[in-house]
């Protein structure tokens, strides 16, 4: 009887033992080997011969176990679309791109195809930290108590209010979400708007 250990081997139910590394070839009704990442099919399999694979040429790749007769062309990261390269294309992996700093992915089709500028967060807020940079537009959240942020910016972080006493000063005006504490020398007179107010 026929050997069944390695491809090509007969398949009556049109499924193969190792779905990742083998595929069903319907003309010959057999299971054949896929080509490993970084290669393509240079000669198709038959009942008498397994798939023959060849290495992808320069500037082309195949990422997965495949039965493709060509390799995919490497594509550069398109700066016009706001993308930058983080890893070059290899025979086994496409060029790895990400959004440029200050941008987020606005169009996604298996991978990011178009980045746009991150929205500014107004004073008193900051961008909520995300698991992955560039994945989505900014979601602005108020500064937490004791912190401020005084610009319109996509990336500025809320900073802790200055503690006047740490500098040997006293507080002239309390900090808000949009402004830092105002400190003064303890010997300085009160500002005019506070005259008449008695400091205990």
């Amino acid at each position: 009887s026929q050997p069944q250990a390695v491809p090509p081997y007969a398949s009556e139910n049109q499924t193969c033992r190792d779905q990742e590394k083998e595929y069903y070839e319907p003309q010959h009704r057999i299971c054949c080997s896929r080509c490993p990442p970084g290669t393509y099919v240079s000669a198709k399999c038959s009942r008498i011969r397994d798939t023959v694979c060849a290495t992808c040429a320069e500037n082309s790749y195949n990422e997965h176990w495949n039965y493709l007769t060509i390799c995919q062309l490497c594509r550069p990261c398109d700066p016009v679309m706001g993308l930058e390269e983080i890893a070059p294309c290899t025979s086994k992996r496409k060029t790895q791109c990400r959004c440029q700093p200050g941008m987020f992915c606005a169009a996604w089709a298996l991978e990011c195809t178009h980045c746009e500028l991150l929205s500014d967060c107004p004073p008193g807020t900051e961008a909520e930290l995300k698991d992955e940079v560039g994945k989505g537009n900014n979601h602005c959240v108020p500064c937490k108590a004791g912190h401020f942020q005084n610009t319109s910016s996509p990336s500025a972080r809320c900073q802790p209010h200055t503690r006047c006493e740490n500098q040997g000063l006293v507080e002239a005006a309390p900090g808000t979400a949009q402004s830092d504490t105002t400190c003064k020398n303890p010997l300085e007179p009160l500002p005019p708007e506070m005259s008449g107010t008695m400091l205990m």
Epitope: Q2, A10, E12, P26, Q27, H28, R29, S46, R47, I48, R49
Partner: antibody, heavy 120, light 107 residues
Framework: EVQLVESGGGLVKPGGSLRLSCAAS????????MYWFRQAPGKGLEWVAT????????YYPDSVKGRFTISRDNAKNSLYLQMSSLRAEDTAVYYC?????????????WGQGTTVTVSS | DIQMTQSPSSLSASVGDRVTITCKAG??????LSWYQQKPGKAPKLLIY???RLADGVPSRFSGSGSGTDYTLTISSLQPEDFATYYC?????????FGGGTKLEIK
């Protein structure tokens, strides 16, 4: 009893078209790959077309690719061969055959054949 | 395409003779070879499959042997009904190809 009966042959002019049929009985037609072969007068046998059990896959040798189309109707237990742009060299007896559906891939049953003559 | 060279193209023999027909493939076809008998005006009939296996209902005087590129059909003792044309077919790799045939005639 397994039976394959071809029909539809005849005389046709070069460039013309013809549709052959093969009526199957005595087995579960939808379980089998089906084939067309042909034999020119006084010559040997030649493979012409293959269709998978469900009809999703079709295959042809270069000699007929783009001119012949194999199809099937599993509900009617019927196999077809649509032939167009016919040439004198397509003159032959056309046979339908069943491919064994185990692991050995031989052709266990053949029809009696239908004659196609391409001549002006 | 795999070329199938069948020999002889014709053969004269007598009832009771032992007859051998050979088929040589252009490359190793891993025993994916079958033999068919055809009588005038009739369809081919399967005799042997997978090089050596006798098809159902075929008399035991027919046998097949061989491997790799070289295959043989043997009829151990010719009977009157055996006078016909015989074809080998490789179905190891598409396109399937037949030998040119051997016409077996009465001497």
């Amino acid at each position: 009893e397994v039976q394959l009966v071809e029909s539809g042959g005849g005389l046709v002019k070069p460039g013309g078209s013809l549709r052959l049929s093969c009526a199957a009985s005595g087995f579960t037609f939808s379980d089998y790959y089906m084939y067309w072969f042909r034999q020119a007068p006084g010559k040997g046998l030649e493979w012409v077309a293959t269709i998978s059990d469900g009809g999703s896959y079709t295959y042809y040798p270069d000699s007929v690719k783009g001119r012949f189309t194999i199809s099937r109707d599993n509900a009617k237990n019927s196999l077809y061969l649509q032939m167009s742009s016919l040439r004198a060299e397509d003159t032959a007896v056309y046979y339908c055959a069943r491919e064994e559906n185990g692991n050995f891939y031989y052709f266990d049953y053949w029809g009696q054949g239908t004659t196609v003559t391409v001549s002006s | 395409d795999i070329q199938m060279t069948q020999s002889p193209s014709s053969l004269s023999a007598s009832v009771g003779d032992r007859v051998t027909i050979t088929c040589k493939a252009g490359q190793d076809i891993k025993s994916y070879l079958s033999w068919y008998q055809q009588k005038p005006g009739k369809a081919p009939k399967l005799l042997i499959y997978y090089a050596t296996r006798l098809a159902d209902g075929v008399p035991s005087r027919f046998s097949g042997s061989g491997s790799g590129t070289d295959y043989t059909l043997t009829i151990s003792s010719l009977q009157p009904e055996d006078f016909a044309t015989y074809y080998c077919l490789q179905h190891g790799e598409s396109p399937w190809t037949f030998g040119g045939g051997t016409k077996l005639e009465i001497k």
